[in-house]
């Protein structure tokens, strides 16, 4: 990711910028953006970044609000890179099953599953 | 999701079936399946289920191994339903920003971020 700071620090800074610019961002009272109904965030990255794009196009740029959207685009780059890594390595069935078991285990313990 | 048991129970049962049928599933030693190289599983659901499809087509069906693949297809249906809910509701900027803050907060605390 072409940034001088680690992604984790980038995320922290972006959270702070989001708070700082909240008033400016909510100025458009007619704008509507898709908001996921659940908290399985990683499933919704595409929609989240589409929403960010919509918001950016409606926001007066300048100063540190530009930095906010720049950061968000770097975070998107990072996530896109992670998505590329989903199918990059072809491994034996054994390793795939290990990953599948881990995936289901995480689903079992960490996902937000509604009955 | 068209299943008589809740998704959470379905996931638990599938984990058990995966252990039971492991020996049968790894019988094909030449088969190679894409395995994600990171642990942000939700980003990789498409590739995971493509891999499951590959595995199913190479596995002798019958008995409870069929139940395993049936369960996995129900889990896929559940996830597809969750993905639909990502963009289902168009809300105001205020709510989008609350969700974005939550998403970045989760990225900050729970994601496995490589520097």
């Amino acid at each position: 990711i072409p940034t001088e700071i680690p992604t984790s620090a980038l995320v922290k800074e972006t959270l702070a910028l989001l708070s700082t610019h909240r008033t400016l961002l909510i100025a458009n009272e007619t704008l509507r953006i898709p908001v996921p109904v659940h908290k399985n965030h990683q499933l919704c990255t595409e929609e989240i970044f589409q929403g960010i794009g919509t918001l950016e196009s409606q926001t007066v740029q300048g100063g540190t609000v530009e930095r906010l959207f720049k950061n968000l685009s770097l975070i998107k780059k990072y996530i896109d890179g992670q998505k590329k890594k989903c199918g990059e390595a072809r491994r034996r069935v054994n390793q795939f099953l290990d990953y599948l078991q881990e995936f289901l285990g995480v689903m079992n313990t960490e996902w937000i599953i509604e009955s | 999701i068209p299943t008589e048991i809740p998704t959470s129970a379905l996931v638990k049962e599938t984990l058990a079936l995966l252990s039971t049928h492991r020996t049968l599933l790894i019988a094909n030693e030449t088969l190679r399946i894409p395995v994600p190289v990171h642990k942000n599983h939700q980003l990789c659901t498409e590739e995971i289920f493509q891999g499951i499809g590959t595995l199913e087509s190479q596995t002798v069906q019958g008995g409870t191994v069929e139940r395993l693949f049936k369960n996995l297809s129900l889990i896929k249906k559940y996830i597809d339903g969750q993905k639909k809910k990502c963009g289902e509701a168009r809300r105001r900027v205020n709510q989008f920003l609350d969700y974005l803050q939550e998403f970045l907060g989760v990225m900050n605390t729970e994601w496995i971020i490589e520097s």
Partner: antibody, heavy 119, light 107 residues
Framework: QVQLVQSGAEVKKPGASVKVSCKAS????????INWVRQAPGQGLEWIGY????????RYNQKFKGRATLTVDKSTSTAYMELSSLRSEDTAVYYC????????????WGQGTLVTVSS | DIQMTQSPSSLSASVGDRVTITCKAS??????LSWIQQKPGKAPKTLIH???RLIDGVPSRFSGSGSGQDFTLTISSLQPEDFATYYC?????????FGQGTKVEIK
């Protein structure tokens, strides 16, 4: 089954504070926002605010900002609403209500807690 | 804040009657409106969400309609257990706001 059980009735003097609890059971606590609503005797319903147990983020009705504080204890799946500088017009039944999704309708309500402010 | 104006504030009806309650928002709230029933001394109960979606377990005699600013709750055939106060709630924007309520009484 999904339940929200609130603490018992309270009688407070003007100027004091009250802390009402709302214990959740039957679901994963961090999955759903908890809203707080109040109802003065013979009056309608009024939204105080919500808290997201997932990240402790809360948002308030401006009318209550500075006086109401929403918190959660994840270890006990309990949400709290504290109201300070109480006055007689704060006498009301206070309800917690679970949000079905993110900023959706209230699908489960607590039984209510009567707070009486009287000198 | 978004104002929710409910009418009528009270009505008298008989068992079997068709009852209609309306709610008007001071601005466009899309379809983010729910209808809530409250019986004396009891906690509120949500009947309908997103303007017209009936919540599981709620009898089909209840129905909702509308979008934008104008909304309606209809009880097709009033039953004895339906005598209560009904509120609309907009959850489109913060702060969420309720209508002032409509008390449905026995004629």
């Amino acid at each position: 089954q999904v339940q929200l059980v609130q603490s018992g009735a309270e009688v407070k003097k003007p100027g004091a504070s009250v802390k009402v609890s709302c214990k959740a059971s039957g679901y994963t606590f961090t999955n759903h926002h908890i809203n707080w609503v109040r109802q003065a005797p013979g009056q309608g319903l009024e939204w105080i605010g919500y808290i997201n147990p997932y990240n402790d983020y809360s948002r308030y009705n401006q009318k209550f900002k500075g006086r109401a504080t929403l918190t959660v204890d994840k270890s006990t799946s309990t949400a709290y609403m504290e109201l300070s500088s109480l006055r007689s017009e704060d006498t009301a039944v206070y309800y917690c209500a679970r949000d079905y999704g993110n900023f959706w309708y209230f699908d489960v309500w607590g039984q209510g807690t009567l707070v009486t402010v009287s000198s | 804040d978004i104002q929710m104006t409910q009418s009528p504030s009270s009505l008298s009806a008989s068992v079997g009657d068709r009852v209609t309650i309306t709610c008007k928002a001071s601005q466009d709230i899309n379809s983010y409106l729910s209808w809530i029933q409250q019986k004396p001394g009891k906690a509120p109960k949500t009947l309908i969400h997103r303007a017209d979606r009936l919540i599981d377990g709620v009898p089909s005699r209840f129905s909702g309609s509308g979008s934008g600013q104008d909304f309606t709750l209809t009880i097709s055939s009033l039953q004895p257990e339906d005598f209560a106060t009904y509120y609309c709630l907009q959850y489109d924007d913060f702060p969420y706001t309720f209508g002032q309520g409509t008390k449905v009484e026995i004629k």
